[in-house]
């Protein structure tokens, strides 16, 4: 579809004859009937196939032709047409002369022709005007003409159909040769597509307006690139959705579980080195002169019993000293100036004479001890508990606290590490030499039986098209990340269908 | 139940520098932002930026580049604002506030109490 | 920066409904959501989320609150206004960056 458009730009008919040669009374009043048809190599009489055209009188003898409306016609002249261009025409101007005012061919005498021209050619579609003159031995006619689409058809011959949108079915202009133009945030081949925000993920995130970024389930973000990890993750992130991978030091399900009691803690008292030794458990090396679980008790030099034959112990600032009773000195009261003579030996007690009577020996009955038999027996100095255990005297007795991990009288025994039950889901424990071992129970696997592999929630292809999709391992269900123009629990709707999502 | 509890008043000087805390509890906290409101009589409500809890991300409004650092420390539940060279244009009461970011949508469902920060030599 | 603008103040008899607006200074919606949110904040107290993407109700908010509007245009409704709701009300977007709030519009009572 498109336009044969003619403007007439000067007439001369200087003498103001017809083509008879006859002059017209008063002058020649002169109005034009235009002719488009198909191209003929000569051009006859014959049907306008590409339509007619009559102007008003436009003047009289010779006149200049305005460019705009004149008399209640139009110039440039239009000659419509509803097909395709086909790049050649004929094209026939006649100027008549009007003595009265009805124009019609039928109420004009057949000698009221002023002059005829014919022309024929090629003619492309295009906005620039091919100026022509045709010159008779009386009249002369300068003109100019073009082809020109109509609103909304483009191309070579005005064949392609274009029409600006900006709604649902599309977001464009067109171009001149009806290709479609997108307006700015916009894309894909109608221009229905929207330019999401600039970053927005390709795969986790789409929009359904320019700028926009909305977030497949499991993302989450400015720009939906970060997954929301397992509800519940404590001390841990995820790569995809629903992930919890434990920070250094955290471990389970939820990375709730302290590995790492000692950095978190410090349990150790008194510059102790602590050392970890399974969840919330720990050990501390005392620094000399430290004691206790923690190592929160300051040990007294004392409690070594230092001094011999029944010297008392005082503790110092920089050490401890013996007192010394009658008859010994020394630094540990060790030298002795007594012989058996003296009666040195305590709590029944049998004296030897040694080195000629220079000195002597004590044997000592049971439950005593020390050079003249003056000591109770410590038990505990043998240091009979195993494992770091910590000897305690109890009157009569002794007794062993152990250390995590340990038990029996002299903490002998190594505490069964399955009796804490640490094999989650049902998972039978096994006791091994330095630690322990899970068996799972099948769908659960991990050093604790902690990872959940059973039910495959995607094994039914639950997401519609071609969506990919991910199991939620704390229950057992699956999540959908839709492709592009998809929404929906299940990929199941097209965008231009909203879902309500549950945030 | 979601609870935000930020640290108390300050006091502070011209050139100074401010740290104030917001402690979480009450749901998964490293799946989360937390976002940080300035408000004053002035110029209302203007948000200063977000901080992913999981991550450390930051975003932060142009306005407020050069002047709010925030951090986080996930073993404490507790996020951070550091607000430094202060002026008096500074004193406001600032809010920390959980917040919900999916592509174009934000808002912020809990808010903590808010800090009175005044700036005055 | 978007521009969101609400009027100061709303005089308003216990028990009518009551209509705050907020307007903003570019479109805040796609064909799928608006990006705008509303907030009541109650004297010497933090904000409140009422309203999120123009109209889906906060947990916990009395269906008296509702939310409307698309495009430039937008609406919090309170009906019936009670007492407890006597507040400033800001609304938020969230279409543009920086994220910005309106100057919050005090409702008073008549």
């Known amino acids: 579809s498109g336009v044969f458009q003619l403007q007439l730009q000067e007439f001369i008919n200087e003498r103001g004859v017809l083509a008879s040669g006859r002059p017209c009374e008063p002058g020649c009043r002169t109005f034009f009937r235009v002719c488009l048809k198909h191209f003929q190599a000569v051009v006859s009489p014959g049907p306008c196939t590409f339509g007619t055209v009559s102007t008003p009188v436009l003047g009289t003898n010779s006149f200049a032709v305005r460019d705009d409306s004149s008399g209640g016609g139009r110039n440039p002249l239009q000659l419509p047409f509803n097909f395709t261009w086909p790049g050649t025409f004929s094209l026939i101007i006649e100027a008549w002369h009007a003595p009265g005012d009805d124009l019609r061919p039928e109420a004009l005498p057949p000698d009221a022709l002023i002059s005829k021209i014919a022309i024929q050619g090629s003619l492309a579609v295009g906005q620039n005007w091919l100026l022509d003159e045709q010159t008779s031995t009386l009249t002369r006619l300068r003109y100019s003409y073009r082809v020109i689409c109509s609103d909304n058809y483009y191309g070579d011959n005005c064949s392609r159909l274009c029409k600006k949108r900006n709604d649902h079915f599309g977001h464009y202009v067109c171009q001149p040769d009806g290709n479609l133009s997108c307006l700015p945030g916009w894309t894909g081949e109608y221009c229905q597509q929207p330019i999401c925000l600039s970053g927005c993920h390709e795969q986790n995130g789409y929009c359904s307006k320019p700028a926009e970024c909305l977030c497949r389930p499991g993302w989450q973000g400015r720009l939906c690139n970060e997954c929301i990890p397992h509800n519940g993750c404590r001390h841990g992130t995820c790569s995809t959705p629903w992930q919890c991978t434990c920070d250094e030091g955290w471990g389970g399900l939820f990375c709730d579980q302290d590995l790492n009691y000692c950095t978190h803690h410090s349990p150790c008292k008194n510059g102790a080195t602590c050392s970890n030794s399974g969840q919330r458990s720990y050990t501390c090396t005392c620094r000399p002169g430290y004691t206790g679980v923690d190592c929160e008790l300051e040990l007294s030099e004392c409690d070594s019993n230092p001094c011999r034959n029944g010297g008392s112990c005082k503790d110092q600032e920089d050490g401890y000293h013996c007192l010394c009773p009658p008859g010994y000195y020394g630094l540990h009261c060790e030298h002795s100036t007594l012989s058996c003579a003296d009666s040195p030996c305590f709590n029944g007690g049998s004296c030897r004479e040694r080195n000629q009577g220079a000195n002597y020996a004590c044997e000592c009955p049971p439950n005593f001890t020390g050079s003249n038999c003056e000591k109770k027996v410590d038990r505990c100095t043998s240091n009979p508990c195993a494992n770091g255990g910590q000897c305690l005297n109890r009157g009569p007795s002794r007794m062993c606290r152990c250390r995590p991990g340990f038990t029996g009288t002299y903490c002998e025994l190594h505490v069964s590490d399955c009796a804490r039950n640490p094999c989650a889901h049902g998972g039978t424990c096994h006791d091994l030499e330095n630690g322990l071992m899970c068996t799972c129970p099948a769908g659960f696997s991990g050093r604790r039986c902690e990872v959940r592999t059973s039910i495959d929630a995607c094994a039914s292809s639950p997401c519609f098209n071609r969506a990919t999709c991910y199991t939620d391992l704390s229950t057992d269900t699956f999540v959908c990340n839709c492709p592009y123009g998809f929404v929906g629990s299940r990929c199941e709707f097209p965008v231009g269908l909203p879902p309500s999502f549950p945030w | 139940e979601v609870q935000l509890q930020q640290s108390g008043p300050e006091l502070a000087k011209p050139g100074s520098s401010v740290k104030i805390s917001c402690k979480a509890s009450?749901?998964?906290?490293?799946?989360?932002?937390i976002s940080w409101i300035k408000q004053t009589t002035g110029q209302g409500l203007e948000y200063i930026g977000y901080?992913?809890?999981?991550?450390?991300?930051?975003d932060y409004n142009e306005k407020f580049k050069d002047k709010a650092t925030l951090t986080v420390d996930k073993s404490s539940r507790t996020v951070f604002m550091q607000l430094s060279s202060l002026t008096p244009g500074d004193s406001a009461v600032y809010y920390c506030?959980?917040?919900?970011?999916?592509?174009?949508?934000?808002?912020?469902?809990?808010w903590g109490q808010g800090v009175m920060v005044t700036v005055s030599s | 920066d978007t521009v969101l603008t609400q009027s100061p103040a709303l005089a308003v008899s216990l028990g009518q409904r009551v209509t705050i607006s907020c307007k903003a200074s570019?479109?805040?919606?796609?064909?799928?959501?608006?990006?705008i949110y509303w907030y009541q904040q109650k004297l010497g107290q933090q904000p409140r989320l009422l309203i999120y993407?123009?109209?889906t109700l906060a947990s916990g908010v009395p269906a008296r609150f509702s939310g409307s509007g698309s495009g430039t245009d937008f609406t919090l409704n309170i009906d019936p206004v009670e007492a407890d709701d006597i507040a400033t009300y800001f609304c938020?977007?969230?279409?543009?960056?920086?994220?910005?709030f309106g100057s919050g519009t005090k409702l008073e009572i008549k």
């Open positions: 506030a959980k917040s919900i970011l999916l592509g174009s949508t934000y808002y912020l469902d809990y």
């Open positions: 938020q977007q969230s279409w543009s960056d920086p994220f910005t």
């Open positions: 570019r479109s805040l919606s796609s064909p799928m959501y608006s990006y």
């Open positions: 009450g749901y998964t906290f490293t799946s989360s932002y």
């Open positions: 901080i992913n809890t999981g991550s450390g991300g930051t």
């Open positions: 993407r123009a109209s």
